[in-house]
């Protein structure tokens, strides 16, 4: 069967997000991937979206992320724009209303996005073969 267009959009957005660092890609987020053995795919997507939403809600107007120059401000705005797009598409793929995120482990946003990209690429390779 064909891959969902949303999945392709997610991978495209993740590629954009992981190609370049910004002032805040080194900040930490909850690492939902550290112990996700008994988690369904839909739950994983839902929880990933929850983590991203927590991040951009907390840091969208964070002065450390907005930086001191118009250039840094622009990059942060782009980062937030992509995170919101990713969040929206992940919710669509998950099809769940809410999900708990209780893990204590942390990872940088950069590493979180890389891990999510790996998972999405694996999913894409399965559905496209």
């Amino acid at each position: 069967h064909k891959c969902d267009i949303t999945l392709q959009e997610i991978i495209k957005t993740l590629n954009s997000l992981t190609e370049q660092k910004t002032l805040c890609t080194e900040l930490t987020v909850t690492d939902i991937f550290a112990a996700s053995k008994n988690t369904t795919e839909k739950e994983t997507f839902c929880r990933a979206a929850t983590v991203l939403r927590q991040f951009y809600s907390h840091h969208e107007k964070d002065t450390r992320c907005l930086g001191a120059t118009a250039q840094q401000f622009h990059r942060h705005k782009q980062l937030i724009r992509f995170l919101k797009r990713l969040d929206r598409n992940l919710w669509g793929l998950a099809g769940l209303n809410s999900c708990p995120v209780k893990e204590a482990n942390q990872s940088t946003l950069e590493n979180f996005l890389e891990r999510l990209k790996t998972i999405m690429r694996e999913k894409y390779s399965k559905c496209s073969s």
Partner: antibody, heavy 123, light 106 residues
């Protein structure tokens, strides 16, 4: 296809203000994903970034030129402009306008440039 | 301010030769490094962005590598049309160009 065109006087007297305009065609200057810059190349020297302006109107300037530079945007005319005050012979250069940024990336290089306009500072 | 030190300032090579230009940043700039080609009377042309990505339509003989502070630009087989001045440019923190490397044919 997006094109940029610089315009303005080719000769400016010392101590006066150099004024150039860049007209953008084939695309909107108002996109949130892109920004606009000025770069110059003095004869026999290398490229020098002058400054950039973003869709919000916020600007960044080269620290070495900051006290003399103003960049502004006119969205109604799809143009952005450069003003460089108190010019000297050292400001003689080819002046380029360019577009940076991208809709599918966090940031991108200045990839689209105008053809450049030569400005000579002389009395 | 971030300084970009480019070397050599000029070089002469034969058609078919491998040409290498280096660029060193005064501080870590991650992969925010571009390479431009400038020919006399023409606007600079973006060849490589983010240290190693080939801009669309640019011949594959051009390549770039590096991250952090040290970067390399390579022309695998020099062609007559490659006669130009090449510049590195950081855009990690504002924008700074290297001094340029003038490439000539022997």
């Amino acid at each position: 296809q997006l094109q940029l065109q610089e315009s303005g006087p080719g000769l400016v007297k010392p101590s006066e203000t150099l004024s150039l305009t860049c007209t953008v065609s084939g695309g909107s200057i108002s996109s949130e994903s892109y920004y606009w810059g000025w770069i110059r190349k003095p004869p026999g020297k290398g490229l020098e970034w002058i400054g950039s302006i973003y869709y919000s109107g916020s600007t960044d300037y080269n620290p070495s030129l900051k006290s003399r530079v103003t960049i502004s945007v006119d969205t109604s005319k799809n143009q952005f402009s450069l003003k460089l005050s108190s010019v000297t012979a050292a400001d003689t250069a080819v002046y380029y306008c360019a577009r940076g940024g991208a809709s599918d990336r966090i940031d991108h290089a200045f990839e689209i440039w105008g053809q450049g306009t030569m400005v000579t500072v002389s009395s | 301010d971030i300084q970009m030190t480019q070397s050599p300032s000029s070089l002469s090579a034969s058609v078919g030769d491998r040409v290498t230009i280096t660029c060193q940043a005064s501080q870590d700039i991650s992969n925010y490094l571009n390479w431009y080609q400038e020919k006399p009377g023409k606007a600079p042309k973006l060849l490589i962005y983010d240290a190693s990505n080939l801009e669309t339509g640019v011949p594959s003989r051009f390549s770039g590598s590096g991250s952090g502070t040290d970067f390399t630009f390579t022309i695998s087989s020099l062609q007559p049309e490659d006669i130009a001045t090449y510049y590195c440019q950081q855009y990690y923190d504002l924008y700074t160009f290297g001094g340029g490397t003038k490439v000539e044919i022997k």
